[in-house]
Amino acid sequence: CDLPQTHSLGNRRALILLAQMGRISHFSCLKDRYDFGFPQEVFDGNQFQKAQAISAFHEMIQQTFNLFSTKDSSAAWDETLLDKFYIELFQQLNDLEACVTQEVGVEEIALMNEDSILAVRKYFQRITLYLMGKKYSPCAWEVVRAEIMRSFSFSTNLQKGLRRKD
């Protein structure tokens, strides 16, 4: 499955929306920064199978959707930008679902995907626990926004690599 150009553009649009969503200065939140342990190994160029990477992307977008569609998130961000962000994520989920159904078939791959999906879920669990611990403060959301932007930009770069391999 060739990840379509539109998916990469969608990812860029999602990044731009995330960037626009910022409400307070990053710089008042330096002390709140946190290492969430992004599971980079899941996406590593040397060891990932294509199906594994696509499954991990899918899970990452799904979890981002879940994170930003909570009541606490709605209170933190501009509603119009948030709605646009949902649309981009939803479009990307559709793109990736088409890819996942094409790529996944062999049982071993499905098992391997389980590990990568679990790693992504644990990553988002850490993010959720951090937000809870910080009582969903504006700075906590700001830190999380930067983290999601970083993981999105990482996956955008990787998608370019995936497309080149085809």
Partner: antibody, heavy 120, light 111 residues
Framework: QVQLQESGTVLARPGASVKMSCKAS????????MHWVKQRPGQGLEWIGV????????TYNQKFKDKAKLTAVTSANTAYMELSSLTNEDSAVYFC?????????????WGQGTTVTVSS | DIVLTQSPASLAVSLGQRATISCRAS??????????MHWYQQKPGQTPKLLIY???NLESGVPARFSGSGSGTDFTLNIHPVEEEDAATYYC?????????FGSGTKLEIK
């Protein structure tokens, strides 16, 4: 590829003001912070401040708060720094640099630098 | 402001040997798993180049002979084996709090 093109050498009188530019290309200008850094001849680097072109948000090193003013014009993909009330201490090379990895606040791409010479 | 003290101010290392540069912060620049210390290389007449970010992460395209370590207040940049093209001034920079500051630089000469 990412490029930051800075304006040329500036010669100015003490007490005057200068405005230098930094034109960005090869990336989404509005979604990356832009830092400005000072380097005096044969000396180290000093962080002046940073601007977010997307909304014009700025943060300054207190030392440069009354010296430097950062602005950006998104339609031109260009960031600007204006230095006022120039003294000999302001003679230096000034770099614009792109912020890297969001809130890690390090700098991956650098302009070639604008040389400012203050002399009467 | 956090003061970064680099040592030595200059060093000469033979080709193929190890160069070790230290950077000490006047206050911790580490928080919740990350150390906000970064390393740059500046060759004469050129702009600085990012080598290492977050104390130990090698920037893309930077040779593996460069490595960074440390946390809290003490950080080290290692170059091994040193090559001719590594002759430059090396700066550490922190982003632990405002204002961000740089070390005074270490000039590396290749013997």
């Amino acid at each position: 590829q990412v490029q930051l093109q800075e304006s040329g050498t500036v010669l100015a009188r003490p007490g005057a003001s200068v405005k230098m530019s930094c034109k960005a290309s090869g990336y989404s200008f509005t979604t990356y912070w832009m830092h400005w850094v000072k380097q005096r001849p044969g000396q180290g680097l000093e962080w002046i401040g940073v601007i977010y072109p997307g909304n014009g948000d700025t943060t300054y090193n207190q030392k440069f708060k009354d010296k430097a003013k950062l602005t950006a014009v998104t339609s031109a993909n260009t960031a600007y720094m204006e230095l006022s009330s120039l003294t000999n201490e302001d003679s230096a090379v000034y770099f614009c640099t792109r912020n890297y990895k969001y809130d890690y606040y390090t700098m991956d791409y650098w302009g070639q630098g604008t040389t400012v010479t203050v002399s009467s | 402001d956090i003061v970064l003290t680099q040592s030595p101010a200059s060093l000469a290392v033979s080709l193929g040997q190890r160069a070790t540069i230290s950077c000490r912060a006047s206050k911790s620049v580490s928080t919740s798993g990350h150390s906000y210390m970064h390393w740059y290389q500046q060759k004469p007449g050129q702009t600085p180049k990012l080598l290492i970010y977050l104390a130990s992460n090698l920037e893309s395209g930077v040779p593996a002979r460069f490595s960074g370590s440390g946390s809290g207040t003490d950080f080290t940049l290692n170059i091994h084996p040193v090559e001719e093209e590594d002759a430059a001034t090396y700066y550490c920079q922190h982003s632990g709090e405002l204002p961000f500051t740089f070390g005074s630089g270490t000039k590396l000469e290749i013997k």
